[in-house]
């Protein structure tokens, strides 16, 4: 006769491990008992359970409620046992010893491998600002047994580097993603991908990139000279910029206070019916937590009664 078993049994933490041990013998042979033991290099051989043809399943008190026989129907030659709710400490070598009559004893050893799936965590790096050099965007850490694989999935150009720390029963892997921040990266996803044999599918954690920047400011509204004549209504100057965080806008007049009736509404300066007093140099001041920008324009309101005068539009930043 011979024993049918496995060299390695692999289970995920918390699952039940079936330790297989089947005696393939002649029809007239009987299995008297199957003794299961844990083989520890330090503690030696310690009995786990014993299946006896007459007295049934005996379980070591240290494994009470954790060792069972597989559900019926059972073959009398099947000495397999179930180890419930596998934990990391169960990982190791097991021995099955089958006593048969009249053939004698047979034994086999197998290794139980308990996979510990990782629970990854993603930590964003310091605030990203346009103009910085190579900067940490995020780091991702996952600990498991065996060591998990940690990679990045993103359209953003950058570099990744990994390091691992080995513990007695697991390994922690940390991967960092570095990039040179630019405004085009704003809102782009950066996804940490963790692979592990104990996971049915990869675990993914996504971080949305935020890069602080402030664009140059410019002013629109002076393109149509006909709008800037005495008496015209609806004349506006609009300050153009963009940034992250979104910028605030402030309007001033360089050569004095804003004329009465001129309304400031965010990025837009609205004028009442135009008079020559609205001529002057207007400054748009744009700022966010990162920086500030100015753009100024010179407005000259033309009096139609004075045909010798043209509207002089000068823009400077």
């Amino acid at each position: 006769g011979e024993l049918e078993t496995s060299d390695v049994v692999t289970v995920v933490l918390g699952q039940d491990a079936k330790l297989p041990c089947f005696y393939r013998g002649d029809p007239d042979e009987q299995v008297g008992q199957v003794a299961w033991a844990r083989v520890d290099p330090n503690e030696g051989i310690r009995e786990l359970a014993l299946l006896h043809s007459k007295y049934g399943l005996h379980v070591n008190p240290a494994y009470e409620d954790r060792v069972e026989q597989p559900p019926p129907p059972r073959d009398p030659l099947d000495g397999s046992v179930l180890l419930r709710n596998a934990v990391q400490a169960d990982e190791g070598e097991y021995e099955c010893r089958v006593s048969t009559f009249p053939a004698g004893s047979f034994q086999a050893r197998m290794r139980l491998r308990v996979l510990v799936p990782p629970l990854p965590s993603l930590n964003p790096g310091p605030p990203l600002e346009e103009g910085q050099g190579l900067t940490l965007a995020a780091s991702c850490t996952a600990e498991g047994s065996p060591a998990p694989s940690v990679t990045w999935d993103t359209e953003v150009k950058g570099t990744q580097s990994s390091r691992s720390f080995t513990h007695p029963r697991s390994a922690a892997v940390t991967s960092e993603f570095h990039l040179v921040p630019s405004r085009s990266m704003n809102g782009q996803p950066l996804t940490c991908v963790v692979s592990h044999p104990g996971l049915l599918q990869d675990r993914r954690i996504t971080h949305t990139l935020q890069v602080a920047f402030l664009a140059e400011a410019s002013v629109r509204g002076l393109e149509d000279q006909n709008l800037w004549q005495v008496g015209r209504e609806g004349a506006t100057l609009k300050c153009l910029s963009e940034g992250q965080p979104p910028p605030k806008y402030n309007w001033t007049r360089l050569d004095g206070p804003l004329p009465s009736g001129v309304r400031v509404k965010g990025d837009t300066l609205g004028f009442p019916p135009l008079t020559t007093e609205h001529s002057g140099v207007y400054v748009c001041h744009v700022s966010n937590e990162l920086s500030s920008r100015d753009s100024q324009v010179t407005v000259e309101v033309l009096d139609p009664e004075d045909p010798g005068k043209q509207v002089d539009l000068v823009s400077a930043s």
Epitope: G32, A49, H52, V59, N60, F101
Partner: nanobody
């Protein structure tokens, strides 16, 4: 030949405790499984509990949680700690031991009487 001698039986009130012992005469062969059966008047012999040399145990459902079997391999002695005794536990308790050589051979003790009064 292995001889088994039980002791510790007696009369006890319901809810009380007793501890049975069974000593095996020294054998050149190691005893594999040792344990206890019982037989109430007019009934068949009934399995109670057994223990292996490695300390693994098995119990009948009727005594699980109340009785505890233990063993001293060096002395070839088996014990049965019986707590929360009930009148239906009244029986003659027999020690059993199995010796494995070319095949399993089972030995029995003469028994010790346990009476639980209500």
């Amino acid at each position: 030949e292995v001889q088994l001698v039980e002791s510790g039986g007696g009369l006890v009130q319901a809810g009380g405790s007793l501890r049975l012992s069974c000593a095996a005469s020294r054998s050149t062969f190691s005893l594999n499984i040792m344990g206890w059966y019982r037989q109430a008047p007019g009934k068949q012999r009934e399995y109670v509990a057994t223990i292996t040399t490695g300390g693994s145990t098995n119990y009948a459902d009727s005594v699980r949680g109340r009785f505890t079997i233990s063993r001293d391999n060096a002395e070839d002695t088996v014990y049965l700690q019986m707590n929360s005794l009930k009148p239906e536990d009244t029986a003659v308790y027999y020690c059993t031991a199995e010796l494995v050589r070319r095949g399993p051979t089972t030995y029995w003790g003469r028994g010790t009487q346990v009476t639980v009064s209500s």
